[in-house]
């Protein structure tokens, strides 16, 4: 029978398993994965904790173990060709022999720290307009900004600052499938700079 | 502590069709199989198959493919075992087992089915 | 399908007797991974059974030590050193190292 396609996500240079979670591990008999080319079969093993792994493409080599009881599989050191589909064939004891289970691995790079650049629209009133923008060092897809205590989603993020609002302080946290980091801003800076005529202020 | 507490005992017509409950607890229900087997009174003990309680694949003995259906209510944490089209030789009690991948651990109570006209 | 024959059918004993039940397989019960997964369950009067030994000679939690198994390949033994009341039921032997799995017809022990 066979199985919707579950999304696993990995982080670059690190480790991602696949859940097989095999309840009867005394009825598998083999397990062949595939992706663009025949990857590894996996069979069991005298130990009931690590199930045997043969490897049968080169870019695998030395990157793929099996987890017993559950027959769960782990890629380490991941590269970003590693992405794409995943099937398992399982092959059992019992009727109905064959069972498909199906992946989509997406890989991610591990954030870092955002940056906040600073952009002075204009002063009236001693209240300020202010354009925060909320960018991390390299294009990464899927990446969502969001910004404290406002709320606010999107990495562009517009501020009328007044007096009282001194004390706050204006956190971005920019996050994708696999990690989340943040930089932050105070409201003193952010309005300090009129009076020395600057109209961009980066932060970090 | 890991309890499997069965439905109560079942008196049945032969053809009818009767549905037995085993709800488990103390334990994360989606986590091991749940196996059912039979016992004739009298008699000794039949492994009939199991359910995968993560994607409710059923697997079947033979002797018990047809008529017998396994499913689950996972929200409930309750496997439940049907015989359709009941007969004679269906008079047993019945009884859910938890597996813990290596062999048998817990085991329900047992419900007994009587088929009788 | 795997027969699992069991004998003796009834076993008379004595409190603080040793007690040997055998259990012989049609085939060879050792699955592909290397192991062997013959159990032994006991079945008091009117309960349900409960795991005593798994693959071969392990004892399950809480199982005394006065239970032991052994054996391999088709024969094993279930060998229990001094009998006490609380041991009386019947015993029976379980393969899960194929399909279907297959249970012995039961050895009853019973007081002498």
């Known amino acids: 029978k066979d199985s919707e396609i579950f999304t696993v996500n990995g982080i670059l240079g690190e480790s991602v398993t696949f859940p097989v979670n095999i309840q009867e591990p005394r009825q598998v008999k083999i397990i062949a994965w595939t992706s663009k080319t025949s990857v590894a079969y996996v069979t069991p093993g005298d130990s009931e904790t690590a199930p045997v792994v043969t490897v049968t493409h080169r870019n695998y080599y030395e990157r793929i173990h099996a987890l017993g009881p559950n027959y769960n599989l782990v890629i380490s050191d991941l590269r970003m060709e590693d992405a794409g589909d995943y099937k398992a064939d399982i092959n059992t004891q019992a009727d109905p022999y064959t069972t498909t289970k199906r992946y989509n691995l997406q890989i991610y790079r591990r954030l870092g720290k955002p940056k906040i650049t600073q952009s002075l629209m204009a002063s009236v009133n001693s209240t300020c307009n202010v354009t925060l923008t909320c960018s991390v060092e390299k294009e990464e897809k899927n990446v969502t900004y969001n910004w404290s205590p406002l709320g606010e989603e999107g990495n562009v993020l517009q501020i009328f600052q007044t007096p009282e609002d001194q004390e706050l302080t204006y956190t971005c946290t920019a996050q994708n499938p696999v990690s989340n980091n943040s930089d932050s801003i105070s409201a003193r800076q952010l309005c300090a700079d009129i009076a020395m005529g600057f109209r961009t202020h980066h932060t970090g | 502590q890991i309890q499997l507490v069965q439905s109560g005992p079942e008196l049945k017509k032969p053809g009818e069709t009767v549905k037995i409950s085993c709800k488990a607890s103390?334990?994360?229900?989606?986590?091991?199989?749940m196996h059912w087997v039979k016992q004739a009174p009298g008699k000794g003990l039949k492994w009939m198959g199991w359910i995968d309680t993560a994607t409710g694949e059923p697997t079947y003995a033979d002797d018990f493919k047809g008529r017998f259906a396994f499913s689950l209510e996972t929200s409930a944490s309750t496997a439940y075992l049907q015989i359709n089209n009941l007969n004679n030789d269906d008079t047993a009690t019945y009884f859910c087992?938890?597996?813990?991948?290596?062999?048998?651990?817990?085991w329900g109570a047992g419900t007994t089915v009587t088929v009788s006209s | 399908d795997v027969l699992m024959t069991q004998t003796p059918l009834s076993l008379p004993v004595s409190l603080g007797d040793q007690a040997s039940i055998s259990c012989r397989s049609s085939q060879s019960i050792v699955h592909i991974n290397g192991n062997t997964y013959l159990e032994w369950y006991l079945q008091k009067p009117g309960q349900s059974p409960k795991l005593l030994i798994y693959?071969?000679?392990n004892r399950f939690s809480g199982v005394p030590d006065r239970f032991s198994g052994s054996g391999s390949g088709t024969d094993f033994t279930l060998k229990i050193s001094r009998v006490e009341a609380e041991d009386l039921g019947v015993y029976y032997c379980?393969?899960?190292?194929?399909?279907?799995?297959?249970f012995g017809g039961g050895t009853k022990l019973e007081i002498k």
């Open positions: 379980f393969q899960g190292s194929h399909v279907p799995w297959t």
């Open positions: 693959k071969v000679s």
């Open positions: 087992v938890k597996s813990a991948y290596w062999y048998f651990d817990v």
């Open positions: 103390g334990y994360t229900f989606t986590t091991y199989s």
